[in-house]
């Protein structure tokens, strides 16, 4: 008789999830000499231990603490780039500007990027059929709690000038419900962080509006200012040119506004 299985609204665990996590871990530790000491079997065991045999709507940050401990990594605290709803460009930027880091450039972020996972209460099985959706099912699911945990720690580590890339094509350029808006903004440490600098990325070819005047950006400025952190904002009118100029800053066309 097939065992009754909870049907969730979200997609199931990414296929070959254990193999993918292990392979990514080995690859990361090979590329980053400072993380060579990391034991990927132990990382996978700790990752698995955070959600296996647990109800996928009852996951806590505490469940991920063994993984956080094993994945402890020091990134230059003044070289942190946060992003919201514009992941691809943020990652393209840090691939060029190698001394800056998004969360996905760290071991734990790299391991989990674009993956979904969940288990089932009281069984050691991974659920490849469905996983809880944050809105339709529950917020304390394995994926959401993981990103909340690593995002909080990443923001807490930041210092000096912190940059955030925001998507100017969205109706809410700054969204209070995004991970950036709900977690990272509130965990920047005023005693360490002097300024949050927002880069608003324009989507339209001929879009010359000053999106730094957008009401949601003003809302972000207000939240940040109340936390005793300075705020600044820049329009990135031409993201393609912006990336090109990061690659080749000496290019004569890079002195004009981008």
């Amino acid at each position: 008789v097939p065992r009754w299985r909870q049907q969730w609204s979200g997609p199931g665990t990414t296929k070959r999830f254990p193999e993918t996590v292990l392979a990514r871990c080995v690859k990361y530790t090979e590329i980053h000499p400072e993380m060579r000491h990391v034991d990927c079997q132990s990382v996978w065991d700790a990752f698995k231990g955070a959600f296996i045999s647990k109800h996928p709507c009852n996951i806590t940050e505490e469940d991920y603490q063994p993984l956080m401990k094993l994945g402890t990594q020091t990134v230059p605290c003044n070289k942190i780039l946060l992003w919201s709803r514009i992941k691809d460009l943020a990652h393209q930027f840090t691939q060029v500007q190698r001394d800056m880091f998004t969360l996905e450039d760290t071991l734990l972020g790299y391991l989990a990027d674009d993956l979904t996972w969940c288990g089932e209460f009281n069984t050691s099985k991974i659920n490849y059929q469905s996983c809880p959706d944050w809105r339709k099912d529950c917020s304390n699911n394995p994926v959401s709690v993981f990103w909340k945990t690593v995002s909080r720690r990443f923001a807490e580590a930041a210092c000096d000038v912190v940059h955030v890339m925001l998507n100017g094509s969205r109706s809410k350029i700054f969204d209070k419900n995004s991970t950036f808006g709900s977690v990272e903004v509130h965990n920047l440490q005023p005693e360490k962080v002097q300024t949050l600098e927002a880069w608003v990325i324009h989507g339209g070819r001929e879009d010359s509006r000053d999106l730094c005047q957008d009401p949601t950006i003003k809302e972000l400025e207000s939240i940040i200012s109340k936390r005793n952190i300075q705020f600044s904002c820049k329009n990135i009118y031409r993201p393609d040119k912006f990336l090109q100029c990061v690659k080749n800053p000496e290019d004569s066309s890079c002195t004009s506004e981008i």
Partner: antibody, heavy 118, light 110 residues
Amino acid sequence: EVQLVESGGGLVQPGRSLRLSCAASGFTFSSYAMSWVRQAPGKGLEWVAVISYDGSNKYYADSVKGRFTISRDNSKNTLYLQMNSLRAEDTAVYYCAHLRFGYGMDVWGQGTTVTVSS
Amino acid sequence: QTVVTQEPSLTVSPGGTVTLTCASSTGAVTSDHYPCWFQQKPGHPPRALVYSTDTIHSWTPARFSGSLLGGKAALTVSGVQPEDEADYYCLLYYGGARVFGGGTQLTVLG
């Protein structure tokens, strides 16, 4: 310097028990999976067991399953192998190895000899 | 019981090239088995040479290389030296458990 030192080997009669220890130093023992590997006289290497960094996951070779138990005490930086119901074919040099996933066993002890004979 | 098979013995002349292979009874060896290779000389514990299929350890001479070859893991020694005479073992990963190959005794002539 990373070092592993096995102890506890010796001559034991079939059916009896023995506990091997492996003292680790020079690395963060509590962050690594650890393994036992054995080598019978004149024979090849045989993987025996592995234990996760925190002791929660253990895997055994079929030949020792149900008779051997791998354990660890992270506060003492020590790995153990409890061997029960010993047989003549368990006679071997037992090595403790520092295991990094994907990197294989990059540090080995010198081994301790177990002889099972009446 | 998974069995990992290696050539029992191989002979090579100094300066020659030799390839040792490692096959799995469960099917083709892939990168998911994270093949590792070890060298062992009489009276000594094994020494890791190659990990993750094709990456050599910092202490491994450049004449050693790892690869996947026709569904098997392979260790190639190019420009064999007399000191390469030893037993060689592969190790495969099976989702927690590991299995060593039976070993290859490499003899360097002369």
